[in-house]
């Protein structure tokens, strides 16, 4: 009995069959395939599988495989049979399946589509027609993310210079790993006259708070107190601030970074919700000072990509001194 | 004024187990990330992991991922790093240092010798 | 994975001169994340710099930092006794492998 086990172990099984590649949603690619036709009967069948490139190689028990991918380009499967989990293994005669990306003119696609999501409240693409493409070409925008039961076509076409866009409401939801997907989004024409483009952004990259809203500067001895409002959506450890203090006097230009601070001096109004507070020290009351910030995500919680908000508005205290 | 005060040196067997802690102090220690560093005799340091003991939310480097466990307790403000099994490659200076959300280390502990040897 | 290079490896200066080490990047980093560290022997280490040329709370004017994308350096405008040490860069989960300055 050892010996017939071993003997299929090696013996090289014969290939899957009826390999097949649909397309789910906007860039979900899914390939399924049948076990092989008469496989030795005490091979406990295993699938191995890689991309055209090589990359990505899996064994596994199941007869399928999917990939979330922008079908810009050909992607190819490659799936063979084989009898146990050892790479080594030689498997069956691998069989391909491929599919190609829309046909059309590669000139006509759009390019630069890109999206940001906004205070994980709404996202933002943007994109540059193609070369071939005449002036006056109607895009349309569809995306779909795991909380959609269907494709959504965007409503919110723009244009802004050179770039159309459109934006589309995408709300974090409490779900914990709601952020550990992507959202699909393939741009076309109304009159199906150009290539669709594809992307796909994954909702742990390209995320822009909103700006924040200082609240109130007051002085404490030599001390500037700062309270601001931070931007909704966010968990306190995924977000720091930049407070930059200008004197009109002495023209520096102090930076400080800050952690959510809580407000508990007797100088800040106490126990706002959702606000922060934070100590400049060392500025001269009776200058001009003026206060503004911005805020980031944390890498350890969104990939870092240098993404800061906008800077909130100014806020001055003190007075400007006569040049005299 | 901040400060992290960690257990002191250890000496154990291989194939042990091991917790060293770390107690923070002068800040609220449930607002900020709390990471560990490593550093092997005579050689640099290294990343290991953090903590955010406000949901102990962690996230550790891949190199030590499943090598070590790291917990807290915010009701006492400390920090832990353990080991179910030691082995002689982990006899090293293990440092905690607060880990602000710009991701620089601005206060340390003193350091734990942690030595393993047969 | 990013890769922090530091350079020189041993850089051997006077007291009084200009120190200048050099951080490099595998691939672009954002510069808020970049910081350096200070380690005399037996010793923790200790932050000088952070977001790349913000000097933290209590380290000398004489300390200072810039660059951006790939190329960082932190300099020692004037070597005092007790700067001789070993200084890290680090960005996130990745500390370059050190740069030595000892007395000449």
């Known amino acids: 009995d050892y010996k017939d086990d071993d003997e299929s172990r090696t013996e090289t099984q014969p290939p899957v069959t009826n390999l097949s590649v649909s397309v789910e949603n906007l860039c979900t690619v899914i390939w399924t395939w049948n076990p092989p036709e008469g496989a030795s009967s005490n091979c406990s069948l295993w699938y191995f599988s890689h991309f055209g490139d090589k990359q990505d190689k899996k064994i596994a028990p199941e007869t399928r495989r999917s990939i979330e991918v922008p079908l810009n380009e050909r992607i190819c499967l490659q799936v063979g049979s084989q009898c146990s989990t050892n790479e080594s293994e030689k498997p069956s005669i691998l069989v391909e399946k491929c599919i190609s990306p829309p046909e059309g003119d590669p000139e006509s696609a759009v390019t630069e589509l890109q999206c940001i999501w906004h205070n994980l409240s709404y996202m933002k693409c943007s994109w540059l027609p193609g070369r071939n493409t005449s002036p006056d070409t109607n895009y349309t925008l569809y995306y779909w993310h795991r909380s959609l039961e269907k494709i959504h076509q965007c409503e919110n076409i723009f244009r802004e210079g050179q770039y159309f866009g459109c934006s589309f409401d995408l709300t974090k939801v409490k779900d914990s790993s709601f952020e550990q997907h992507s959202v699909q989004i393939m741009v076309k024409d109304n009159a199906g006259k150009i290539k669709p483009s594809f992307n796909i952004v994954p909702l742990t990259s390209r995320v822009k708070p909103d700006p924040p809203h200082i609240k109130n500067l007051s002085f404490h001895n030599d001390d500037l107190y700062v309270q601001w409002e931070n931007p909704q959506n966010f968990i306190s450890r995924c977000l720091f601030y930049e407070v930059e203090v200008n004197n009109s006097q002495t023209e520096t230009h102090n930076v400080f970074y800050v952690q959510e601070a809580k407000c508990e001096n007797p100088e800040f109004e106490r126990n706002v919700e959702n606000t922060s507070c934070f100590m400049v020290p060392g500025v001269l009351p009776d200058t001009l000072n003026t206060v503004r910030i911005r805020v980031k995500t944390n890498k350890l919680c969104y990939e870092d990509d240098k993404l800061w908000s906008n800077w909130s508005q100014e806020m001055s205290i003190g007075k400007k001194r006569n040049s005299t | 004024e901040v400060q992290l005060v960690q257990s002191g040196a250890e000496v154990k067997k291989p194939g042990e187990s091991l917790k060293i802690s770390c107690k923070g102090s002068?800040?609220?220690?449930?607002?900020?990330?709390i990471g560990w560093v490593r550093q092997m005799p005579g050689k640099g340091l290294e990343w290991m992991g953090v903590i955010y003991p406000g949901d102990s939310y962690t996230r550790y480097s891949p190199s030590f991922q499943g090598q070590v466990t790291i917990s807290a307790d915010k009701s006492i403000s400390t920090a832990y790093l353990q080991w179910s099994s030691l082995k002689a490659s982990d006899t090293a200076m293990y440092y905690c240092?607060?880990?602000?959300?710009?991701?620089?280390?601005?206060?340390w502990g003193q350091g734990t010798l942690v030595t393993v040897s047969s | 994975e990013i890769v922090l290079t530091q350079s020189p490896g041993t850089l051997s200066l006077s007291p009084g001169e200009r120190a200048t080490l050099s951080c490099r990047a595998s691939?672009?980093?954002?510069?808020?994340?970049l910081a350096w560290y200070q380690q005399k022997p037996g010793q923790a280490p200790r932050l000088l710099i952070y977001g790349a040329s913000s000097r933290a709370t209590g380290i000398p004017d004489r300390f200072s930092g810039s660059g951006s994308g790939t190329d960082f350096t932190l300099t020692i405008s004037r070597l005092e006794p007790e700067d001789f040490a070993v200084y890290y860069c680090?960005?996130?989960?990745?500390f370059g492998q050190g740069t030595k300055v000892e007395i000449k």
């Open positions: 680090q960005q996130y989960e990745t």
């Open positions: 002068g800040y609220s220690f449930t607002s900020y990330w």
């Open positions: 240092a607060r880990f602000p959300n710009w991701g620089s280390f601005d206060y």
């Open positions: 691939q672009s980093i954002s510069s808020s994340y």
